[in-house]
């Protein structure tokens, strides 16, 4: 049994880091493998993660961690029974993938403006809370070409767009994802999408 693709890990910079790797053949990850991880710090204890299968030869492990700080560094040991398959380290602050935003809502009753709001996925005491920016994806269910991404570079988890910039009388969907420039993170996963019917009313023409 050998590791084909070494573990790569990302942290949500809160409580979970996720490590993925591939073995050289079909593997029952949960029965055959264990991933041990330990904070490099005086008196810290080792923890064991039981991996799950992620495709035929792929494994994934969700490492539970206490509140992460930028200096944290973990040793990682991948074991198959008594055999050490791989040894490495992981610094969560250098491999951050934020949590996905939630509670995306489209408010269609604000005159002729669409107001999209969502929730910051972090509590106020987490460092990322005040460092997330967002991308909002809006697309038409009728026209595959009509697929837009709005970059929200301010901190407020909301976006206002004129309803008239979208086509009237058809259905749209929206979703949102987050990233943090300060840690050069990857993008989060997309939030669940939400759907609405765009029924923009033309203003009365005055001649």
């Amino acid at each position: 049994m050998k590791v084909l693709q070494e573990p790569t890990c990302v942290s949500d910079y809160m409580s979970i880091s996720t490590c993925e790797w591939k073995m050289n053949g079909p593997t029952n990850c949960s029965t055959e493998l264990r991933l041990l991880y330990q904070l490099v710090f005086l008196l810290s204890e080792a923890h064991t993660c039981i991996p799950e299968n992620n495709g035929g030869a792929g494994c994934v492990c969700h490492l539970l961690m206490d509140d992460v700080v930028s200096a944290d560094n973990y040793t990682l040991d991948l074991w198959a029974g008594q055999q050490l398959l791989w040894k490495g380290s992981f610094k969560p602050s250098e491999h951050v993938k934020p949590r996905a935003p939630g509670n995306l809502t489209v408010h269609t009753n604000v005159s002729d403006t669409l107001l999209l709001t969502w929730s910051n996925p972090y509590p106020p005491d987490n460092y990322l809370y005040n460092h997330l920016t967002y991308a909002v994806n809006i697309w038409s269910e009728n026209d595959p070409a009509d697929f837009r991404i709005y970059n929200v570079t301010y901190l407020e988890p909301s976006l206002r767009i004129a309803a008239s910039t979208l086509k009237s009388g058809i259905s749209y969907r929206a979703r949102v994802r987050a990233w943090a420039q300060c840690y050069n993170t990857t993008w989060s996963e997309w939030s669940p999408s939400t759907k609405w019917h765009n029924s923009y009313r033309e203003p009365f023409e005055q001649h």
């Epitope: 026209d143 595959p144 070409a145 009509d146 697929f147 837009r148 991404i149 709005y150 004129a162 008239s164 910039t165 979208l166 086509k167 009237s168 923009y200 033309e202």
Partner: antibody
Amino acid sequence: QVQLQQSGPGLVKPSQTLSLTCAISGDSVSSNIATWNWIRQSPSRGLECLGRTYYRSKWYSDYAVSVKSRITINPDTSKNQFSLQLNSVTPEDTAVYYCARGWNYGYYFDYWGQGTLVTVSS
Amino acid sequence: EIVMTQSPATLSVSPGERATLSCRASQSVSSNLAWYQQKPGQAPRLLIYGASTRATGIPTRFSGSGSGTEFTLTISSLQSEDFAVYYCQQYNNWPYTFGQGTKLEIK
């Protein structure tokens, strides 16, 4: 900075096929927030959108009704370009042909190629 | 398809004066309308999108207004480089369509 560079012959014989290519730099033909368009301009017809190709987890093409039976627009991801083929041309297809990028918030044309005058004549 | 009609076909204005160009759509295009400037031998250049938003690098003397079927492009104080042909274009419904153009010439 996005740039579109057109290439192809300026003279095509009637009943033959007009072929033009648009090379993209500064963006990707596989972008999911762009469309890649061919537009032509003639004194008789003005500016006319002929068709477009775009990627949204799979490739799509849309064509104007006036040329639908004769036109093909194909992306080439390996060369980051897209092409126009217009079959069975007649002198009425004589025009300046432009490629252009349609962009994100509704797909207006924000970058254009330099234009190619194509004359259909024997 | 949506027919775009521009007026006037030709507009003669003196440098420094204001120019107002009109565009009408045969059916509503919401605010999915763009304006382009074209000079001889050149490709069209995007000026305005979303009926009223200036494209990157476009001077503030260019402004757009309108929604639905009636649109206006205003150039507040004409400079010598502004004399050209101007086109409106709807991108609400495929196929996207252009107006026939307004030629802005020096009076």
